[in-house]
Each structure stands twice: as C-alpha cells, then as structure tokens.
Interface confidence: low
C-alpha cells in the first residue's frame, strides 16, 4: 500500500480539532491580478504582501497595487497601501528587503513618463512606515544592498549610471557613467564594467573592469577586454576576450582584482558561455560549455586558489546562457551535488556527488519503486530527479528539489526511476540520508515544504481543480494525515513558509472565484498543537553522515573528516523550535588519495585513485602563468581537495617556484593598472 | 505472464454508452500506468486514455474529453473505460495497454466496439 | 500538439533486405519514442522504446537510432515473419502522446 495508507502508521491524535483552531483565513479585497510576498527579517513574522492589478484600457494600461502587512507570520493582514500613498509599485522590482535582521524596505513606485525621476518608498521599520523619497534618475535594477551595511545601496539608471546612496536611499550620487554591471564585493567594495564606445552589447568583449573601495571617492581599473565578470566565494572571476581571436578565458582573482590569474579552464567561442555553478571560500564549480548548440557543457572543480582544475563532469546539461541547469546544492548534507547529464542518445539522467564533484554516481532506485519503461533492466536502474530543465520544458513538475540545513539529511523531489528521466507524471521522491537511498512518499507531483527544521513536511496536491485539501507528515514522509482546511475549494497558487524552516506556520495563496470576481485568499495554518511538546534528549538519535559501510574505520569520511549528528527520531512527534540548532560532531580523518585531486599537468583515469602525467605533458617542465609571473612546478601529481580536513595518512610533495619571469597572458599586470580620484 | 484481457465490447447505437473492462495478472498491478489505445477498421493506431498508477491523474486527447472516462480499481487489478455519447466514428477495436512510462510495453488482445443503427 | 510524420506508408521488400523506417516529430522530443509491430488481426508489439533500446524478446535485426526530431527504425535483414505494421509513438512532453500514421511492410 501507499505510505501512509497501513495500519502500521500512528496517527496523530485529534489533529483535526487541533488545526481547526489553528488555520486563519484573510480574504484580501482585491480583484485578481498578480501577488508577491516577501518576508521581513528572520523570526520577526513580519510578512509584505503586494498585489497588482492591470486595467487595460484602450490607450493605456491602468494598475493598481495595494500593500499588506501581516506581524503574526501570515495569521492577520493589515492593509498598509495609505502608508504609500496609494501609489502603483513596479513588481518587476520586487520588494526590495535587506540584509539579515535590518528591517529596511525599498518599494519602485511607478511614475508618469514626463518625470525626472523615479520614486521608491523606504522603511527601516519592518514596514511599520515608509517615507517616500524622489529619484534624481530612472531605476533600471532594484536596489541592491551592501552585505556589510544595509545604509549603503546602488543601483543601476535607466541611462546606464551608477548611482550609489550612503543613507539608505534619501540622497543619491551617480559615481560612473557607462555601466553595464555592478556587484556587491566584500567590504563595500563595487566591481562593475564599463563601455567606451556606445552600448554595453557594442562593446561586449571590449569592456573595462573598475572596483571602488570607497563608495565612488576613487577607482581603479583592474581589467580590460572584458566580456562579464562574476563573484563566487571569495574568488572574483573575469572572463577576457583573448588577443588574436574572438575566443575567451577565465581569469580569477582572490586579491579583490588587484592581481590575476588565468584559470586552467578551456577557451570559449562566441556561442559559448562560462557558468559559476556554485562557490564557497575553499572552490568553486565551473560550467564550461561546449563548442556548438549541443545543450551540454563540462563542470570542473577548483582548486583552493580557483586556477587549477579537476575535470569533474561531461556532458552537464546546460541549455544555452542563462537557460537550464539542474545543477543543485544539497544543503543538507554536505559535499553533496545533484545534476543532469545528457547521455549520447539524448536522454536526460540524474547524477549525485557525495564528495564535492570528485566522483559522480546514479542515484539508488528506490526498494519501493519500480524501473519503468526507460530501463534496459527491469530490475536495475535509478531514481532521475526533477528540477528546472523539467520545469522549464512544461513537464508536470510544479517544485525543483528542496534541502534545508538545519533539516539534516533530507531530500524532497519530483522524480521517475529508470534509465532516463521520463515524461510520464512524476512521483514525490524523499531521502534522509542526503541522497544515499530514496523512497516514494507521495504519488504524483506535489508543493511541499519543510517546517520546524525538518520535524513537519507538509505537501499539497499539484491539480488544475480546485483544492481543499493539505497533507502532513511527522515522521519525515514515511505516514500522512490530510486536513480539509476550507469548506470551499480554491484555485491554489502558492505554499509559503518563512525561510530557514524553522517556522511551524505554513500559509495556503490562492483565490476564489465566483461568477462575478476572483479574489486572493490566503490560509494560514500553525502546527504548533500538532507538536505539542518540546523535544527532549531522548527524541534525538546519533546518525553518521556519509556513512556506507560500518564496519570500515573510515567510514563517513567526506573531505577528510566525518560527522555525526543528533537527529530526531522519526517516531517521535514534538517541538524542534525556532532556536533549534543542528548539533554535530566533527572527527579528523587520516590522509588517502581520495583526498587528494590532480595537480596541474595530471589526471585520474576511470575508477582510479592515482592520478597520472597527462601524455601531452610528460617530459615538460611544468610552468603556468601566476599572478602575473611565470611558475614552475615540481609535483607528483596530487594537491588537497579544497576543505578537506584529513592528517597523517598519504602525504604527496609539491613545490611552486617562482621562476621571475613576466607573463600577462593578455590581461592587464598589476604594475599597468591605472588608478583615478573623483 | 503479463496477461491483459479485455471485455465489455459489442454493438451499441449512436448515442449509446459502454463500458469496457481490463483484467491484468501477472505483474504488481497498482505500480503501473495504464493506458487504452483503439484502431478503427483498416487504420492505425490512436490514443485514447491514460491512468496514472494510483488512480490520481488521467489524460484524454481534447477530441474525446468529456465522453470517455478511464479509472481503475488495484484492488481488483482492473482498468476501465467508461464510454458515453457514442458515434459511428468511435467503432474501433479498443486495446488496453500496460504504461509504465516512455512505452506501452504489454497490450491485451483487443475488445472491438461497434456503434451503428 | 505534437506532430508524427513516418514514412514510407508503404514499402514492399524481400527477404534478406535492409529496410529503414523513418518517423519525423514537429519538435525535439529528446529520445522519448518507441516503436511497435503490428500484425494483421494482432494486437501491437513493443519493438523499441526509448528511441534505441531493444524491447525484451526482441531478435538482434532490429534497432532503433536517431536523437531530437528525426528517429529512424531498421531492420537489417528481413525475416518472412516481419512482414507487418510499424507504428512510431512518442512520449514529450504532456499528452496527447500520438502515434505516426503507420508503415505497411510488404513481400515484394
């Protein structure tokens, strides 16, 4: 039978009575049109909800937008659209919420086509009052905050000025003209490009790199022959057109700009792309797309300094720039990656890292499942999970994967088990183990979400009819209890829940419609009486991460270390709370060759630890361009995996040398760098 | 053995209702789709329906929604194919057909449904 | 919706020949397409899914090839009991999931 539907499934006592009292309904008087919400602030249950209504009328478009404000996690909404004048706000912009526990807002307002400028309303508050402030340019991008200080914004014109405020948005200075992108760096610091001859599509591949350290006082440039640049962990990458032909480079940085090198990555032509799939401060993730309209690239794995690379994957589908990609950050178990690979007959097959892109793997069929019609074996094939590629190709797949750190180990995701993913309606597919073993846990495709750091999963129904209907688990999908939380059946729209999981609110969007309106409506449900005691020592149990074989002394070690977490026994129904904290316990592990990934010059062969001398390189002093000098390397082939904690052990010897010769592989050498003051 | 016997067809008149049953054996019923598949005197092949193994979502091309209903009971490891409305174009052999995702890889011996006055 | 175009119709062979089918679809269906025998007064038979994989009981003569929008049936030598229908099917995408017209194989 289907989880959830033998005996053997407790259920929870009197939980309808319990979630009747709990599920709060708010009708929002407003004609259908479109809804964003955004919360404020972490644990503060302050939530803007913003709906917009377009009139089409015969020479011009009305809108109408209107502001809520809810205190008490979506339970209760005010409305605040007097606290903005009544004004329309642009959605294209969004709500614009700062950094961590700021409580500053920043809302576009729509302005008439004659004006100077345009308008935003801000709040420091959470929202409580806005002050409305005029723009001495047009917005082209919402405003972005500084991470290190919510005061400082920028934002780009629609003249394609940079403009930066030091006092959250009342005064505005435009510190650059001609910009094409500018980022948030570390410590205030801005990075963006510049054009000098017409457009930023004019002169892409031409572009000057400039960083100011001090809000636009002074700048320098730190890079020519542009074509983009990016931010990842504490690299900053810069991809340059080469000299002779159109082709380009990656070049990186961990010094802010200031000196550069060039990444032993691929060229790249005109119709290709460069992609950061994911950084941290030890590495970094690369896409490298192949030559022609092929949808698939190569991802490659840095080392700790982002120059030298480990080939970790082919075939990464990856549609076209800034198209698709399933690759996905398995935030609950670390070192894990999941992504799609384009096999040679052009189907699409799900691979699963454990072990931060070193070694990739079909993920385990799930023991309750069967191979459907895509599998050569019947009996042996894997789970392929679900997530933008799918989305985007209108397949019935409403939700990507969903992990959360503080819910240790677990999965949720739409997926088909065979060779290949299938086209047929998916099923809800749930791990606790971060991807090692899966189960079915819902048939069909399905919202869902995490509550109370994993201790709830609550699921609703993906239909084109409307519903009524919510489905929760306390024993991480294994038994589920439906809950009618309305009478009437409303078109749904959206399952939202405070980000972090830590909440035990879960809000219900959609809208109702009658013959003669359609009107947003929203149900929140609190299942703090589902959970209606605190958990104590006794409901958690020691569980080794990454472990595949007990018996082995180096089991669980991931990156040179293993982990041991205190999880919540799936029997167990209580409170892990707001202020829950993952507790684990972190032990060293000795050195192997797992630990360890190619130096520059090597490479792994298939299903093999030792790495060995690239043919074309055998022989050959091995010199690479560094910062900008000229290097050479004495290696036996290994360098450690980025974060990787291992002692003792297997110890391989390298040595850099510093052979005092200048290369600038065509980019700019420190010693060229010019400098400018405002 | 897959084994897929379908039942339930014969003459009806235009406007008539029928109802067609499938017996499976031979595989773990309720973990598979199920589809039905029909083919009028001397042409090919034409989809008709499909159930998901659960019972949960169903498909139809958009000529023949609102008239034909697929379900299923796993419990009895049978599928079914409600049919109202009938014309002389629905006259077809119908055939049911285990769907377990990108083929329909078991197919019964074919029931023909004949609708005329 | 999408499109199914398979060709020839018809095509009359010997025993011992090499016969191609081909089934041509009005958009990339990324390898989601099986192909099935049919012969008179029979119920189809699952010939090759997933564009190239052999169905279980399958004879070796027959194989399945082609990616995005052009996929291709062969049988390498023909046998006297392959003498039938061909259908190809795909699986993109939502339904409806449509067959190609069909190709009748005949002794020549």
């Known amino acids: 039978s289907a989880p959830g539907e033998d005996e053997e499934c407790g259920r929870v006592r009197d939980f309808v009575a319990k979630l009747a009292n709990n599920t709060h309904q708010h009708v929002f008087d407003d004609l259908r049109g479109s809804v964003s919400l955004s919360w404020v602030g972490d644990s503060t249950g302050v939530i803007l909800v913003l709906t917009t209504f377009h009139v089409p009328l015969v020479i011009m478009t009305f809108g109408q937008s209107k502001l809520y404000r809810s205190e008490d996690y979506g339970k209760n909404f005010k409305d605040i659209t007097d606290l903005i004048n009544n004004t329309f706000i642009r959605t294209e912009f969004g709500m614009a919420i700062g950094p961590e526990n700021s409580g500053k807002v920043v809302l576009t307002a729509e302005v008439s086509g004659g004006s100077r400028g345009g308008r935003i309303f801000r709040s420091s508050d959470f929202a409580k009052n806005f002050v409305q402030t005029d723009l001495p340019f047009h917005p082209l991008t919402q405003m972005m905050y500084s991470p290190q200080n919510s005061d400082y914004l920028l934002a780009l014109s629609t003249e394609n000025g940079l403009w930066v405020s030091k006092n959250f948005g009342g005064k505005w200075e435009e510190i650059h003209k001609a910009v094409c992108l500018a980022k948030w760096g570390s410590d205030n610091t801005i990075f963006f490009t510049t054009y000098a001859n017409g457009s930023c599509k004019a002169d892409l591949g031409a572009l000057e790199l400039w960083r100011t350290s001090d809000l636009g006082k002074s700048f320098k440039t730190i890079g020519v022959k542009i074509y983009s640049f990016g931010l990842g962990g504490r690299f900053l990458f810069a991809s340059v057109m080469a000299d002779k032909d159109t082709t380009r480079r990656i070049h990186v940085s961990t010094d802010q700009g200031d000196t550069w090198s060039m990444a032993q990555l691929p060229s790249v032509g005109q119709e290709q792309f460069y992609s950061i799939l994911a950084a941290n401060d030890d590495m970094v993730f690369m896409h490298v797309d192949e030559p022609g309209d092929t949808g698939f690239g190569t991802i490659f794995t840095s080392d700790d300094r982002g120059i030298v690379y480990s080939k970790s994957l082919d075939r990464h589908l990856y549609t076209t720039t800034g198209g698709e990609t399933d690759f996905t950050n398995v935030t609950s178990l670390r070192g894990v990656y999941i992504t799609s690979v384009l096999s040679e007959d052009n189907s699409i097959q799900t691979m699963i890292t454990f072990d931060q892109g070193g070694r990739w793997t079909h993920l385990r069929k799930p023991e309750n499942s069967e191979c459907d019609a895509t599998a050569k074996n019947k009996n042996e094939c894997s789970l392929h999970i679900h997530a933008s590629y799918s989305i985007s190709q209108k397949l019935n797949v409403p939700m990507a994967p969903l992990s959360e750190p503080n819910a240790v180990g677990i999965v949720i995701a739409h997926g088909s088990v065979g060779d290949a993913i299938s086209v047929m309606v998916p099923d809800v597919y749930i791990s606790d183990d971060g991807g090692y073993s899966w189960t079915k846990m819902l048939e069909g495709p399905h919202y869902y979400t995490i509550l109370d750091s994993g201790g709830i999963i609550v699921a609703i129904e993906h239909s084109s009819r409307p519903i009524n209907v919510i489905k929760f688990s306390t024993d991480e999908g294994q038994c589920w209890q439906t809950y009618t939380f309305t009478r009437d059946p409303i078109y749904f729209t959206g399952l939202a829940s405070e980000p972090g999981a830590r909440s035990m609110n879960i809000s219900i969007w959609g809208f109702t419609e009658s013959f003669l309106t359609s009107q947003w409506v929203s149900y929140t449900i609190d299942f703090k009486d589902i959970l209606e005691r605190n958990c104590e020592e006794k409901d958690y149990t020691i569980w080794l991460a990454h472990s595949t074989d007990p018996e082995d002394y180096e089991d669980g070690c991931i990156l040179g270390y293993k982990e041991q977490f205190l999880r919540l026994r799936k029997s167990s129904v209580c409170q892990n709370g707001r202020d829950y904290v993952v507790t684990k316990q972190p032990s060293i592990c000795l050195c192997s060759l797992e630990d360890f990934l190619c130096d520059f010059g090597y490479y792994r062969p298939e299903n093999d630890s030792k790495c060995v001398e690239q043919p074309e390189l055998k022989g050959h002093d091995l010199e690479f361009c560094l910062y900008g000098r000229e290097e050479h390397l004495t290696t036996n082939g290994y360098r450690k995996i980025p974060g990787d904690k291992c002692q003792g052990g297997v110890n391989p010897v390298r040595e850099v040398k510093d052979l005092k010769k200048k290369c600038t592989s065509n980019f700019l050498s420190p010693e060229k760098q010019n400098s400018k003051s405002n | 053995e897959v084994q897929l016997v379908e039942s339930g067809g014969g003459l009806v008149q235009p406007g008539g209702s029928l109802r067609l049953s499938c017996a499976a054996s031979?595989?773990?019923?309720?973990?598979?789709?199920m589809s039905w598949v029909r083919q009028a005197p001397g042409k090919g092949l034409e989809w008709v329906a499909t159930?998901?193994?659960?019972?949960?979502?169903?498909y139809y091309p958009d000529i023949l929604k609102g008239r034909f209903t697929i379900s299923r009971d796993n419990a009895k490891n049978s599928l079914y194919l409600q049919m109202n409305s009938l014309r002389a174009e629905d006259t077809a052999v119908y055939y049911c057909?285990?769907?377990?995702?990108?083929?329909?890889?078991?197919w019964g011996q074919g029931t023909l449904v004949t609708v005329s006055s | 919706d999408i499109q199914m175009t398979q060709s020839p119709s018809s095509l009359s062979a010997s025993v011992g020949d090499r016969v191609t089918i081909t089934c041509r679809v009005s958009?990339?269906?990324?390898?989601?397409l099986a192909w099935y025998q049919q012969k008179p007064g029979k119920s189809p038979k699952l010939l090759v899914y997933?564009?190239?994989n052999l169905a279980d009981g399958v004879p070796s003569r027959f194989s399945g090839s082609g990616s995005g929008t052009d996929y291709t049936l062969t049988i390498s030598s023909l046998q006297p009991e392959d003498f039938a229908t061909y259908y190809c099917?795909?699986?993109?995408?939502?339904?409806?999931?449509?067959f190609g017209q069909g190709t009748k194989l005949e002794i020549k």
């Open positions: 997933a564009a190239t």
């Open positions: 159930i998901s193994s659960g019972g949960i979502y169903t």
């Open positions: 099917q795909h699986f993109w995408g939502t339904p409806p999931w449509t």
């Open positions: 031979g595989f773990t019923f309720n973990i598979y789709g």
């Open positions: 057909a285990r769907h377990p995702g990108g083929a329909m890889d078991y």
């Open positions: 958009e990339n269906i990324y390898s989601n």
